[in-house]
């Protein structure tokens, strides 16, 4: 498509738009790796900003005896239903006070003997490099707590004194499910083709997904007056000319004196 | 929703008897348990008398012999006959239900409450 726009070496500029840039009648609009008037450059870092929180999910499954089974608990619209759900939360939320992880249970199954609550504890935890640690550390806890009270509220005489009761023997993990998030990968493939030069560091625990070009890192390249150019071959210096100097080598760290190439001198500093 | 209306309190001498009535609305009488729970000054909520809709009740032993708990479906009533009554009987009683069938004395089990009634057992 071609357009017409106002200003020099404005015509067949859409035609022009690179790396998959899209012309919206004024400029190229770039895709997320490019900037640039043409799209012609690859930006110098990228966005990865990790999730805020990460979660995991617990598959368990306890029996409770202090409830006796009847056919309406199988529908989850039904007030016996509603009733078991809030008891079931509201102990739930005892048992698991003291773990900040914490968020709540999810009840998916009741079924015959006494009760069989098949449910989801939710756990959850703000983003750190640490999270999977913190996660792994709170579903210990949470099989510890879980083991513990269906231990301690059982039936004495088919009589509660708890909230709840339950059967010793009933309690089972199934799975646990973690989020996962790995930003060295999540870099990689945003990255595309460039994806070997970019890399993942950390500033006050938040990754930072970022090519030689970009400043301020530790894989930073320095070009001292030249541009950091990301290229397929890796980053390069594209190197400067000022009135007075030429500037050349990896790290345009070489001057040559303009006057003095004209008298046959070089100098290097 | 089940709404619960307790009443048949009063003032009563040692020895003496009291009937007690839970008068229930909804159409949830004849399925789940329903309970008499009491709390006297300075103590925690109790259960009296427990009844199921599979036929299983429950009395405190402070009160085997003395009280009796029924109901009567077609008046969606509960009901607590009192007899024997001691000075350690004096509390508010309160009328409970829950559409599950329970076993438990514990009151955080129960869903449904009704408004205490008062029973004072003075010479």
């Known amino acids: 498509r071609t357009t017409t726009c106002f200003g020099d070496g404005c015509q067949n500029t859409a035609s022009r738009c690179k790396n998959g840039g899209t012309w919206d009648g004024l400029k190229c609009q770039c895709p997320n790796l490019y900037y640039g008037e043409l799209c012609e450059e690859v930006v110098s870092s990228i966005d990865i900003g990790p999730p805020e929180t990460i979660s995991a999910q617990m598959e368990l499954t306890v029996t409770v005896t202090s409830v006796k089974f009847t056919e309406e608990l199988k529908n989850h619209s039904s007030q016996e239903f509603q009733e078991f759900k809030q008891t079931f939360t509201e102990q739930m939320n005892i048992v698991y006070s003291g773990i900040p992880e914490y968020v709540g249970v999810n009840i998916t199954k009741l079924r015959l003997g006494s009760v069989v609550v098949e449910h989801d504890v939710l756990l959850r935890t703000k983003y750190t490099p640490e999270y999977k640690t913190v996660l792994d550390n709170a579903t210990e806890v949470v099989k510890e707590k879980i083991t513990k009270v269906t231990t301690q509220q059982i039936m004495i005489n088919d009589i509660c004194s708890d909230m709840m009761c339950f059967n010793t023997t009933g309690t089972q993990v199934q799975n646990i499910t973690v989020t996962q998030y790995d930003p060295e990968e999540d870099c990689r493939k945003m990255a595309k083709e460039y994806g070997d030069y970019f890399v993942v560091e950390y500033r006050d625990q938040k990754p930072y997904c970022i090519s030689p070009c970009e400043p301020g890192f530790s894989v930073s390249k320095n070009c001292n007056l030249g541009k950091c150019q990301m290229s397929l071959s890796g980053p390069q210096c594209l190197c400067v000319t000022t009135e007075t100097h030429w500037y050349s080598g990896e790290t345009c760290n070489q001057g040559t004196q303009k006057s003095l190439v004209y008298g046959h001198h070089h100098h290097h500093h | 929703e089940v709404q619960l209306q307790a009443s048949g309190g009063g003032v009563v001498q040692p020895g003496g008897s009291l009937r007690l009535s839970c008068a229930a609305s909804?159409?949830?009488?004849?399925?789940?348990?329903w309970g008499w729970f009491r709390q006297a000054p300075g103590k925690e909520r109790e259960a009296v008398a427990l009844?199921?809709?599979?036929?299983?009740?429950f009395y405190a032993d402070s009160v085997k012999g003395r009280f009796t708990i029924s109901q009567d479906n077609s008046k969606n009533t509960l009901y607590l006959q009192m007899n024997s009554l001691r000075a350690e009987d004096t509390a508010v009683y309160y009328c409970a239900a829950s559409v599950l069938v329970l076993r438990t004395l514990n009151p955080k089990a129960w869903h449904h409450w009704g408004q205490g009634t008062m029973v004072t057992v003075s010479s």
């Open positions: 909804g159409d949830t009488f004849s399925r789940g348990s």
């Open positions: 009844i199921s809709s599979d036929g299983w009740t």
